[in-house]
């Protein structure tokens, strides 16, 4: 028979024959021969391979370095890498999550639109008319101005995006 020029899915061509790739979680030790299938070995502790492969070495699991604010979100297996996330109050600087930075706080005049997670920073928004924020916070939303009317009071000082309105008693009507 003619030697193959292309192989099936999950096979590779070597020495004019198609050999099976190693399954995820295993590395290549010996190519197949005329008499035996490809020899694959399981990845060691703290190693992984996540695809059908012909790698002779497994990859090391990612190390979640606590000195960079990282912690393990999901422990790696022989088929998956470790997933790191950041300690409380911190978030990843990139998709690969190789280091962390402190969550941003929203300045006075701005409120939290979306609270930060381990992988995304705080999203702030300017407080619209009728709302204010007088603190720098990573959690506080813009608060609505106090409604003086519902308290039978009147506005003595208008609110801003950084301050609440100041309510006071209504002027008494003279007879």
């Amino acid at each position: 028979p003619e030697p193959p020029t292309a192989c099936r899915e999950k096979q590779y061509l070597i020495n004019s024959q198609c050999c099976s790739l190693c399954q995820p979680g295993q590395k290549l030790v010996s190519d197949c021969t005329e008499f035996t299938e490809t020899e694959c070995l399981p990845c060691g502790e703290s190693e992984f391979l996540d695809t059908w492969n012909r790698e002779t070495h497994c990859h090391q699991h990612k190390y979640c370095d606590p000195n960079l604010g990282l912690r393990v979100q999901q422990k790696g297996t022989s088929e998956t890498d470790t997933i790191c996330t950041c300690e409380e109050g911190w978030h990843c600087t990139s998709e690969a999550c190789e280091s962390c930075v402190l969550h941003r706080s929203c300045s006075p005049g701005f409120g939290v639109k979306q609270i930060a997670t381990g992988v995304s920073d705080t999203i702030c928004e300017p407080c619209p008319v009728g709302f204010f924020s007088n603190v720098s916070s990573a959690f506080e939303k813009c608060h609505p101005w106090t409604s003086c009317e519902t308290k039978d009071l009147v506005v003595q000082q208008a609110g801003t995006n950084k301050t609440d309105v100041v309510c006071g008693p209504q002027d008494r009507l003279r007879a």
Epitope: K10, Q11, S30
Partner: antibody
């Protein structure tokens, strides 16, 4: 050229042990799974053990599991078969083979 | 275990120059999921160790004359010798190396009629 040379056979009493060796040359030994095949006088061939190229995987038929141990030393191109708890029915010529090539065999005789 | 049954079971008398055919049947399929079939044919001449003739059903091993050919699939396999020569005499064995425990056929002795 390829050469496989067995040694270590001999006369042994029932229940006894032996360690067979096979010196390989002329090919990249570590790339090939290796087997031991035996043949009793006037009988068919019987496969008794295989070891993968790295030595990590070993396979045996039920008739010898727990009594025979195949191993290899890739640094010295040598294949081994440790045989223990020997029985009279283990009497045979033991061949070392890569399947493509075979040695001349070493004779194991189990007799009281 | 997979049983390999050869026929003729004991001997096959032939005249030199004739064609000879030996059949081998496995008790279950020896085709792997990736399509490989580890079916081999060996010749053991008197007083010698076995020699590989055919591997993977139909591939002639290096140095084996082209008068030897292998065919078959699934569970039925055949070794053909197109013109028998004196050096071809001996016992022929089929062997399956697809599933552990690997097994040999009982052997067929090719002899002169």
């Amino acid at each position: 050229q390829v050469k496989l040379e067995e040694s270590g056979g001999g006369l042994v009493k029932p229940g006894g042990s032996l360690k067979l060796s096979c010196a390989a040359s002329g090919f990249t030994f570590r790339n090939y799974a290796m087997s031991w095949v035996r043949q009793s006088p006037g009988e068919r061939l019987e496969w008794v053990a295989e070891v993968s190229g790295s030595g990590y995987y070993t396979y045996y038929p039920d008739t010898v599991t727990g009594r025979f141990t195949i191993s290899r030393d890739n640094a010295n191109n040598t294949l081994y078969l440790e045989v223990s708890s020997l029985r009279s029915e283990d009497t045979a010529m033991y061949y070392c083979t890569s399947r493509a090539y075979w040695g001349q065999g070493t004779l194991v005789t189990v007799s009281a | 275990d997979i049983v390999m049954t050869q026929s003729p079971t004991l001997s096959l008398p032939v005249s030199l120059g004739d064609q000879a055919s030996i059949s081998c049947r496995s008790s279950q399929s020896i085709v792997l999921t990736n399509g490989n079939t580890y079916l081999e044919w060996y010749l053991q001449r008197p007083g010698q160790s076995p020699k590989l003739l055919i591997y993977k059903v139909s591939n002639r091993f290096s140095g084996v004359p082209d008068r030897f050919s292998g065919s078959g699939s699934g569970t039925d396999f055949t070794l053909k010798i197109s013109r028998v020569e004196a050096e071809d005499l001996g016992v022929y064995y089929c062997f399956q190396g697809s599933h552990v425990p690997y097994t040999f056929g009982g052997g067929t002795k090719l002899e002169i009629k």
